[in-house]
């Protein structure tokens, strides 16, 4: 299709080389099409103008994204060629930063229902650059935490070193929805609730004598509880003896509950005691089996390919630890009779 009629928007993504960050592009179809099509400010059926130039589908995922190759080749379907880019409804998510993401991205509706719809498209020219200036050492992170029940704030990473007075007007989005009341480089939250968690996008306009472009940053905000004051507790094994059959394989599971810690480095491991000897066993990786705001349950198994007479004289010890302290639970194997 002919993209010369598409509305054009220029965006700049300046990424930090020190941290992982994501980026998003919204399919900003021209008003009033956008609102009807992508439900960003959804109109009720009564409000739909009679002669809307583009009668879009109500299916939120019914947009098609393309990349325009710089060599003039035909447009490429994003989904087929770029595994690190994911389409979610009307949004394009870039999972990894890098200058190779620079380029022109075009979005348009999948269903073309009238002649007017052909020109219903947006071309976004994205420029991606690594952050070079070290002048702002403490720029806000692209991952920010809000403590539940307290006051907090979300800072726009690309503007966090500027005072509120010098800061340009900022447009904020939360999970793709425009936050119309927020215009500063910082969103202040009087009391943090779990619904404040989400993906925030902050945009501001920068211009020079030739052109203007939108500078965008994405912030992943999570709501957290305060760090635990407790060492982890072992939920399983509960008993200190286990009946087993000689010569048969055996799996002993260790499940432990770790309270929330912002810097979370849980340790869960198995070791064996045999008379005055003690050694750690290489076992399958630990896995998280339940995660809530307050705590996480982690499991790690020890696998005995078969139980031997010697194993009946050994103790199998599960050891768990967090920054507060450690807990152990030992299991003695006992031969099943009859």
């Amino acid at each position: 299709f002919n993209i010369s009629g598409c509305s054009t928007k220029k965006l700049l993504w300046t990424y930090s080389t020190r941290s992982e960050e994501e980026f998003v592009l919204f399919c900003d179809l021209p008003e009033p099409q956008k609102s009807h099509f992508c439900h960003r400010n959804r109109l009720s059926p009564k409000q739909v103008p009679e002669h809307l130039p583009f009668m879009g589908s109500n299916d939120l995922s019914d947009v098609q994204w393309y990349q325009q190759p710089s060599n003039g080749d035909p447009l490429e379907d994003i989904r087929k060629s770029y595994p690190h880019i994911i389409q979610d409804k009307c949004t394009l998510h870039f999972l990894t930063p890098g200058v190779n993401n620079s380029g022109s991205y075009i979005c348009r509706p999948k269903m073309i229902k009238s002649p007017y719809d052909v020109a219903c498209c947006v071309k976004m020219i994205l420029e991606v650059k690594p952050q070079t200036n070290a002048s702002c050492e403490y720029s806000a992170s692209h991952k920010q935490d809000l403590l539940l029940g307290s006051t907090g704030s979300i800072s726009c990473p690309s503007l966090s070193c500027q005072s509120d007075a010098q800061s340009p007007a900022v447009t904020w989005y939360k999970n793709g929805k425009l936050l119309s009341v927020e215009r500063s480089n910082r969103i202040v939250v009087d009391e943090v609730y779990d619904y404040h968690q989400g993906t925030y996008v902050c945009d501001y306009t920068q211009s020079d004598t030739v052109s203007s472009w939108t500078v965008r940053a994405v912030v992943q905000v999570r709501t957290i509880v305060g760090d635990t004051k407790l060492k982890p507790d072992i939920l399983d094994p509960v008993e200190d003896t286990l009946e087993v059959e000689l010569g048969k394989p055996l799996t002993i599971s260790c499940k432990a509950r770790f309270g929330f810690e912002r810097v979370f480095n849980p340790v869960i491991k198995w070791y064996i005691k045999d008379s005055d000897l003690e050694w750690e066993v290489s076992v399958p990786e630990a896995k998280s089996i339940k995660s809530t705001l307050k705590d996480e349950i982690i499991e790690r198994n020890i696998i005995l390919e078969k139980v031997t007479q010697r194993d009946l004289r050994r103790k199998f010890v599960c050891f768990v630890q967090n920054s507060i302290g450690n807990t152990t639970q030992s299991v003695q194997l006992k031969e099943k009779r009859g």
Epitope: L246, G247, I272, L277, W279, V281, L304, E305, K306, T308
Partner: antibody
Framework: QEQLEESGGGLVQPEGSLTLTCTAS?????????ICWVRQAPGKGLEWIAC???????TYYASWAKGRFTISKTSSTTVTLQMTSLTAADTATYFC?????????????WGPGTLVTVSS | DVVMTQTPASVSEPVGGTVTIKCQAS??????LAWYQQKPGQPPKLLID???TLASGVPSRFKGSGSGTQFTLAISDLDCADAATYYC????????????FGGGTEVVVK
């Protein structure tokens, strides 16, 4: 008297295949025994290849043997080792061994070995 | 995979003497270690299991010790019948199963 005996060795062409058989006499492979294959190139040391748990049929291989070697329990008294894509480096005496069953993983009973020569 | 390193490759001692063979594991294997004796033209014979437990019928002149990553086989009061190659083997379970052998030590009795 408990014994193991290997058979099936001999001369094989490079890139060829061969199946070795380990036969037990005086006992059968009960559930707690593991039967394993170990090889020894002329004048060299012992090299573990693979084991099979007689009860569960679970198999264990040395990392270098995965893909080219397959251990199977074919009856209560026989275990085989299938070898494919053989090269001169596979020339060796192949031993089958039985572990200690309930008493552990060390190999308490060995066969006399069978010689495999890979040559054109 | 666990790698077993045996030293020395060869050792020569007179009848009545003592030989010490060392075996090092690339990771902590506790006491999951066996020692074997092999004479030319014969299959190996189990001497010691669990680093220090003598197999049945093995004379007490053979002594295994060590744990973790460092293991030793000592043969005292050497006899001509002890001339053979000795191998250590890791009999370690954990994630999967490993049964690696050391490179062997040839014992010559003068």
């Amino acid at each position: 008297q408990e014994q193991l005996e290997e058979s099936g060795g001999g001369l094989v062409q490079p890139e060829g295949s061969l199946t070795l058989t380990c036969t037990a006499s005086g006992f059968s492979f009960s559930s707690s025994y593991w039967i394993c294959w170990v090889r020894q190139a002329p004048g060299k040391g012992l090299e573990w290849i693979a084991c099979i748990a007689a009860g569960s049929g679970s198999t264990y291989y040395a990392s270098w043997a995965k893909g080219r070697f397959t251990i199977s329990k074919t009856s209560s008294t026989t275990v085989t080792l299938q070898m494919t894509s053989l090269t001169a480096a596979d020339t060796a005496t192949y031993f089958c061994a039985r572990d200690l069953g309930d008493d552990g993983y060390a190999y308490g009973l060995w066969g006399p070995g069978t010689l495999v020569t890979v040559s054109s | 995979d666990v790698v077993m390193t045996q030293t020395p490759a060869s050792v020569s001692e007179p009848v009545g003497g003592t030989v010490t063979i060392k075996c090092q594991a690339s990771q902590n294997i506790g006491n999951n270690l066996a020692w074997y004796q092999q004479k030319p033209g014969q299959p190996p014979k189990l001497l010691i299991d669990y680093a220090s437990t003598l197999a049945s019928g093995v004379p007490s002149r053979f002594k295994g010790s060590g744990s973790g990553t460092q293991f030793t086989l000592a043969i005292s009061d050497l006899d001509c019948a002890d001339a053979a190659t000795y191998y250590c083997q890791c009999t370690f379970y954990g994630s999967g199963y490993v049964a690696a052998f050391g490179g062997g030590t040839e014992v010559v009795v003068k």
